[in-house]
Interface confidence: medium
């Protein structure tokens, strides 16, 4: 229904705390360089204005759209052009073009230092002194680094952060309590960020129809007892919610997400038997719980998929009558039977089925033509299954760090033109798939591996799009979203690449490496590994192993030496010479 004042409507629905959090996220995602203090001032002004509209919906400007109100606020920032350059040009436009312009200027890789977690004591002091400001900083720092983070989910992570600090800051050993708990929140949030970026990419590149197909497959896997019409209702709502968040309509998005959770909890009987535990929770936790819900049990009496989609004499008639609905029912029926498949695989199968009907229904004997379609799915199913098997075996053999290195070598050979920091980030993330998925039961491995890899590769595509350097990467990234992972898997050594010259300074290290945390040490080593591969793309596994082993020993030796600087200065050139020789 239409409201006189949209901002008043959202303020009343969301409540002051969530309203302020969402406005802060919105501003931080649009203007990623502004300091917290500047954003919080704007948030307070918007909140005060919203309150006047709640008191009187006819008050001046209360009838304006939220985009207009937010945009006007952002465009009133002094020195906008000095800090943001081209983005200031957006302010010359009218809505909705102005908002579209802001969206286009979101930076997926902003030039911001990595978010450093303060030392435990300091963190607890500032949290206890002002929890609201502390959590506001958290929202701001995450949102500006991840401009597509799913806003209502970020509020949930801030709530988790709050819980952890509340609990741990009363302990005697604060660090021992905080570190593992905050690491777990950080890990989940980072995965959530790449997953949501993939959803926004899907929406931006391929539109609502493609996203809705993804949602139908996902919902059908989770809720196999729900009717097709119920699944499409949920998929339609989820599509709308994601469209809003990806489009910067964060208040509407969060409000609609809460509405969907309410609907699901009121209609458990027609959706799933597993929802009750989620439905007893407060709103943010309820929505998050529903988003992560385990699959309901598959109905025992499901007939073979072939009955309706291969053997039925009216397949072509049903398809012709309403292609989208017929293909939707196919995707629904196939997905609810296969919680063990990735959504990407299910969408590939639906695409194959559609292509088969397009071809066969135009022929003289359609049933004879499409009669083998299910058998033709086999290679499509085997390919990701083999990928999971070989990669999980490699992970079990090498461990996470070793597996990351293997992936780094593979991807540097596939796309050596890509910048080393981007390759290292992608390989580290791709390599985490082992820890995340390979320890799961067999039936959960494939969906975990492939859907996670797809999200990480989407991040690689998003970064590469900004500065395209590799034709092969561009080709894989330009195609359909569900074909991306197979496209990258199929890439081989780039034969067109002219190897990089060997630069001694790239492999020159100093004693500062000794005091780095383990993660940073690993990144330094992996940077060197990528550079080695760029120098010698066809180096054998043994050659690389020798050089990297030698390098690890060198760092270890010099970090234990009494005069570290001297050790690095004298042993370093020897290492470089030995490495050149080993790779000759």
């Amino acid at each position: 229904e239409a409201h006189k004042s949209e901002i008043a409507h959202r303020f009343k629905d969301l409540g002051e705390q969530h309203f302020k959090g969402l406005v802060l996220i919105a501003f931080s995602q649009y203007l990623q360089k502004c300091p917290y203090e500047e954003h919080i001032k704007l948030v307070q002004e918007v909140t005060d204005f919203a309150k006047t509209c709640v008191a009187d919906e006819n008050a001046e400007n209360c009838d304006k759209s939220i985009h207009t109100l937010f945009g006007d606020k952002l465009c009133a920032i002094p020195k906008l052009r000095d800090n943001y350059g081209e983005l200031a040009d957006c302010c010359a436009k009218q809505e909705p073009e102005r908002n579209e312009c802001f969206l286009q200027h979101k930076d997926d890789n902003p030039n911001l230092p990595p978010f450093q977690r303060p030392e435990a004591e300091a963190m607890c002091t500032s949290f206890q002194e002002n929890p609201t400001s502390f959590l506001g900083h958290y929202l701001h720092e995450v949102a500006r680094r991840h401009p597509y983070f799913y806003a209502p989910e970020l509020l949930y992570y801030a709530e988790k952060y709050n819980e952890v600090l509340t609990q741990c800051c009363t302990e005697s050993d604060k660090a021992a309590c905080l570190t593992p708990k905050l690491d777990a929140v950080k890990e989940k949030a980072l995965v959530a960020a790449v997953r949501q970026r993939m959803k926004c990419s899907s929406m931006q590149r391929f539109g609502e129809r493609a996203f809705k197909a993804w949602a139908v497959a996902r919902m059908s896997q989770r809720f196999p007892n729900a009717e097709f019409a119920e699944i499409t209702k949920l998929a339609t709502d989820v599509t709308k919610i994601n469209k809003e968040c990806c489009h910067g309509d964060l208040l509407e998005c969060a409000d609609d997400r809460a509405e969907l959770a309410k609907y699901m909890c009121e209609n458990q009987a027609t959706i799933s038997s597993k929802l009750q535990a989620c439905c007893d929770k407060p709103v943010l936790q309820k929505s998050q719980c529903l988003a992560e819900i385990e699959h309901d049990n598959i109905p025992a009496d499901l007939p073979s998929i072939a009955a309706d989609f291969v053997e039925d004499k009216e397949v072509c008639k049903n398809y012709a009558e309403a292609k989208d609905v017929f293909l939707g029912t196919f995707l629904y029926e196939y997905s609810r039977r296969h919680p063990d498949y990735s959504v990407s695989l299910l969408l590939r199968l639906a695409k194959k089925y559609e292509a088969t009907l397009e071809k066969c229904c135009a022929e003289g004997d359609p049933p004879a033509c499409y009669g083998t379609v299910l058998a033709e799915f086999q290679p499509l199913v085997e390919e990701p299954k083999n990928l999971v098997k070989t990669n999980c075996e490699l992970y079990e053999k090498l461990g996470e760090y070793g597996f990351q290195n293997a992936v780094l070598v593979r991807y540097t050979q596939k796309a050596p033109q890509v910048s080393t920091p981007t390759l290292v980030e992608a390989a580290r993330n791709l390599g985490r798939v082992g820890t995340k998925c390979c320890t799961l039961p067999e039936a959960q491995r494939l969906p975990c591996v492939e859907d996670y890899l797809s999200a990480i590769l989407n991040r690689l595509c998003v970064l590469h799009e900004k500065t395209p350097v590799s034709e092969k990467v561009t080709k894989c990234c330009s195609g359909s979203l569900v074909e991306r992972r197979p496209c990258f898997s199929a890439l081989t050594v780039d034969e067109t690449y002219v190897p990089k010259e060997f630069k001694a300074e790239t492999f020159t290290f100093h004693s500062d490496i000794c005091t780095l945390p383990d993660k940073e040490k690993q990144i330094k080593k992996q940077t060197a590994l990528a550079e080695l591969v760029k120098h010698k793309p066809k180096a054998t596994e043994d050659q690389l192993k020798t050089v990297m082993g030698d390098f690890a020993q060198f760092v270890d030796k010099c970090c234990k030496a009494a005069d570290k600087d001297n050790c690095f200065a004298t042993e370093g050139p020897n290492l470089v010479a030995r490495s050149k020789e080993a790779l000759a």
Epitope: A226, E227, F228, A229, E230, T232, K233, T236, Y263, N267, A269, T270, D308, N318, V325, F326, T329, E333
Partner: nanobody, 119 residues
Framework: EVQLLESGGGLVQPGGSLRLSCAAS????????MLWVRQAPGKGLEWVSV????????YYADSVKGRFTISRDNSKNTLYLQMNSLRAEDTAVYYC????????????RGQGTLVTVSS
């Protein structure tokens, strides 16, 4: 027991409009997705439109998209089909039906109401 009673059919000229109604009883209407199907003389059943229990989303066969609108009033246990820009090929017996999970098949349907489009 499930009962579905259609009404509103009749003779109408091409380009004209009709509104069909279907009164439901014997089951929980507000938790059931519903659909309209039709059967033209000498032809098989063809589904026309589906509506979710909450009223959205709705789906239409390509042949009626943009001309027909399905709606429901859960407080009155009634399903509607607003038919505009009617064509001769829309001539058929229209049935309302309870929509189950499998494809476009359905559990129960009413006795039907005849719509004739002719000049």
């Amino acid at each position: 027991e499930v009962q579905l009673l259609e009404s509103g059919g009749g003779l109408v000229q091409p380009g004209g409009s009709l509104r069909l109604s279907c009164a439901a009883s014997g089951f929980t209407f507000d938790t059931s997705s519903m659909l309209w199907v039709r059967q033209a003389p000498g032809k098989g059943l063809e589904w026309v439109s589906v509506i979710h229990q909450s009223g959205t989303p709705t789906y239409y066969a390509d042949s009626v998209k943009g001309r027909f609108t399905i709606s429901r009033d859960n407080s009155k246990n009634t399903l509607y089909l607003q038919m505009n820009s009617l064509r001769a090929e829309d001539t058929a017996v229209y049935y309302c039906a309870k929509f189950p999970s499998r494809k476009m098949k359905f559990d129960y349907r009413g006795q039907g109401t005849l719509v004739t489009v002719s000049s």
